[in-house]
């Protein structure tokens, strides 16, 4: 499955939108920084078969979509930017879903992939727990926004590596 060029453009657009979503100066939030233990090895495309990498990407985008689709998220961000951001993620999910169906038919996805998807889910659980503990404060959301920008950048890099493998 060849991910369309529009997919990586969508990812870049999502990053730009996320960058524009800030409501307060991040300079006031230094002390709120937190180690979410991003599972960086899951974004290293070299150790994966293509089907596995696509599954990890899908899980990453799905969890990001879920995180920004909550009521608490709606209260935190400017509505039109949030809607545009969610639309970009939704389009990426559609692209990836088509690929997952196509690729899983070609390759048997081993158990290792389930571990990778679980690692991504646990990562987002840590992010959600942090927001709950910080009572969804503006600074907590700023820290999460910065973290998601970083993980989306890792996703973009994984997609680039996938395209080079084609």
């Amino acid at each position: 499955c060849d991910l369309p060029q529009t997919h990586s453009l969508g990812n870049r657009r999502a990053l730009i939108l996320l960058g524009q979503m800030g409501r307060i100066s991040p300079f006031s939030c230094l002390k709120d920084r937190h180690d979410f233990r991003i599972p960086q090895e899951e974004f290293d495309g070299n150790q994966f078969q293509k089907a596995q990498a696509i599954s990890v990407l899908h899980e990453m985008i799905q969890q990001t979509f879920n995180l920004f689709s909550t009521e608490d998220s709606s209260a935190a961000w400017e509505q039109s930017l949030l809607e545009k951001f969610s639309t970009e993620l939704y389009q990426q999910l559609n692209d990836l879903e088509a690929c997952v169906i196509q690729e899983v038919g070609v390759e048997e996805t081993p158990l290792m992939n389930e571990d990778s998807i679980l690692a991504v889910r646990k990562y987002f659980q840590r992010i959600t727990l942090y927001l709950i503990e910080r009572k969804y404060s503006p600074c907590a959301w700023e820290v999460v926004r910065a973290e998601i920008m970083r993980s989306l950048s890792f996703s973009t890099n994984l997609q680039k590596r996938l395209r080079r493998k084609d």
Partner: antibody
């Protein structure tokens, strides 16, 4: 390879203006903040201020607020530190360094080589 | 502003010695503390971040500990290349502030 390359040494007269630069390469320039640090001859390190190149948001130390201006041009991955009217007491080595912003990553992990500014009549 | 106080301001030690430098913050900074090494005519170099995390490429003889207001940088066995000035820096809130430095000299 991550690099921050600063402009060369400057010799100026009191009252003159000056703009020094710090060019980032080998990483996504807008993903990190750029901080500026002063070191006067034989003295310690003093944090002056910081900029987020993605939107040019700045924060200054109260000691330097109104004395200097920090700016950035993300199109050429360069941050700047400028003075409109130099004083002899501005004589120092000035360093730029990158900061990961709100991400959990090492602060000021890469530094420029420094720009020596000498202000003398 | 958060004040950072380092002690001692200078010390003399021999190669192989265990060296400890302390840093105290005027208020709690959790674990938001960094340690830098600076040699004459060179830019500072990050050694330890978030109080105890060793920066990539830094020898394991360097270690950091502490939280709240009291922090320590330890060099387990001083090497010839370790003679330099060391600075702590709080990363808790702006304005960022440095300690006044500790100069480690050859005995």
């Amino acid at each position: 390879e991550v690099q921050l390359v600063q402009s060369g040494a400057e010799v100026k007269k009191p009252g003159e203006s000056l703009k020094i630069s710090c060019k980032g390469s080998g990483y996504s320039f807008t993903s990190y903040w750029i901080g500026w640090v002063r070191q006067m001859p034989g003295k310690g390190l003093e944090w002056m201020g910081i900029i987020d190149p993605s939107d040019s948001d700045t924060a200054y130390s109260p000691s330097f607020q109104g004395q200097v201006t920090i700016s950035a041009d993300k199109s050429i991955s360069t941050a700047y530190l400028q003075w409109s009217s130099l004083k002899a007491s501005d004589t120092a080595m000035y360093y730029c360094a990158r900061h990961p912003g709100l991400n959990w990553a090492p602060d000021f992990d890469y530094w420029g080589q420094g720009t020596l500014v000498t202000v003398s009549s | 502003d958060i004040q950072m106080t380092q002690s001692p301001s200078s010390l003399s030690a021999s190669v192989g010695d265990r060296v400890t430098i302390t840093c105290r913050a005027s208020q709690s900074i959790d674990e938001f503390l960094n340690w830098y090494q600076q040699k004459p005519g060179k830019a500072p170099k990050l050694l330890i971040y978030f109080a105890s995390s060793l920066q990539s490429g830094v020898p394991s003889r360097f270690s950091g500990s502490g939280s709240g207001t009291d922090f320590t940088l330890t060099i387990s066995s001083l090497q010839p290349e370790d003679f330099a000035t060391y600075y702590c820096q709080q990363a808790h809130s702006f304005p960022l502030t440095f300690g006044q430095g500790t100069k480690v000299e050859i005995k």
